[in-house]
Interface confidence: medium
């Protein structure tokens, strides 16, 4: 056996909607032939399934084998280092991977201008891996909310609307002109999931967008 391999110091999930990635930190002084074995346990079925015998990266996409995450009690994963005939002890994720661990995102934000209003429409994520019936709005069917941040470029302000309770919003621009940039962060009021800010979408507002009414 020779010297025993050290275990990966930590193992954790980073997940978005139907994008479930397992990460681990490398063992110290790993060699070019060191690789990592990944196994998965589904709560309620108390046996470990080997997923990958020899991954040379420090992450593994487990989406395909955790498609039922949103209808299950969750998963644990474990990783060990392998080098030839030697292997380390397993390092297990220290929390249950469940729907609560999924970071909420939006697909995109569409902006348009109408009569001096900026109208925003939040597009929900539509990952290719998701089964047809497992849409964002069917899984998070109630209490969807969005924090909205807007800045004006160039300008001298930013502002946030802390909670919009639907996928559409409007902003009366009150005669302001310039480029407006919008970001959105989703949440679900009844859940503790973290949300991630969307990438910024911008739209230019010029005088031509204002109609004069008597």
């Amino acid at each position: 056996h020779g010297t025993e391999l050290p275990s990966p110091p930590s193992v954790w999930f980073e997940a978005e909607f139907f994008h479930h990635i397992l990460h681990w930190t490398p063992i110290p002084n790993q060699s070019e032939s060191t690789c990592y074995e990944v196994a998965l346990l589904r709560y309620g079925i108390e046996s470990w399934n080997s997923i990958s015998n020899c991954s040379q990266t420090l992450s593994y996409d487990l989406t395909a084998v955790t498609l039922d995450l949103y209808h299950s009690n969750g998963y644990r994963a474990r990783v060990r280092a392998v080098d030839g005939s030697r292997h380390s002890n397993w390092t297990v994720t220290n929390t249950r991977f469940s729907v609560d661990e999924v970071t909420l995102t939006v697909g995109s934000v569409n902006l348009e201008i109408h009569n001096g209003f900026i109208l925003g429409k939040i597009q929900l994520p539509r990952p290719k891996m998701a089964p047809a019936n497992d849409t964002y709005e069917s899984i998070f069917s109630h209490f969807r909310e969005y924090e909205i941040a807007i800045r004006k470029v160039p300008g001298n302000f930013t502002f946030t609307h802390k909670k919009v309770k639907h996928e559409n919003f409007s902003l009366l621009t009150s005669g302001e002109v310039g480029e407006f940039c919008v970001q959105v962060k989703p949440s679900v009021a009844s859940r503790s999931n973290k949300g991630m800010w969307s990438k910024e979408e911008c739209i230019s507002l010029t005088r031509q967008y204002f109609t004069v009414t008597n």
Epitope: T160, K162, S174
Partner: nanobody, 127 residues
Framework: EVQLLESGGGLVQPGGSLRLSCAAS????????VGWFRQAPGKGREFVAA????????YFGDFVEGRFTISRDNSKNTLYLQMNSLRAEDTAVYYC????????????????????WGQGTLVTVSS
Amino acid sequence: EVQLLESGGGLVQPGGSLRLSCAASGRTFSSHTVGWFRQAPGKGREFVAAITWNGDTTYFGDFVEGRFTISRDNSKNTLYLQMNSLRAEDTAVYYCAAATGQVWSLQYLRESSYAYWGQGTLVTVSS
């Protein structure tokens, strides 16, 4: 009619924190968008932050850079401005102001949208 009275100003070292309060008299406080402006010596009045009647929307001047938070307690008719990581250039008289209207609108960035003003509280940031 809304009367506004600021408090909490004073001398603070760079990097320090202060919490300003604005007490309102008048039953309609909870229906107003309220905010803070500031006026540095020899300069015009500058928008700092505002918050809508129900706290859903907050507005900030770009110099704030995440250092300040604005909040309100309608049950106490009070507006707050928590100021962290203060800099010498934050030295100014800080005014509390109340606007009319409840639309989510950029009008609240403008001094002219505010009908009611307090007397101001002086914040000095110096070592």
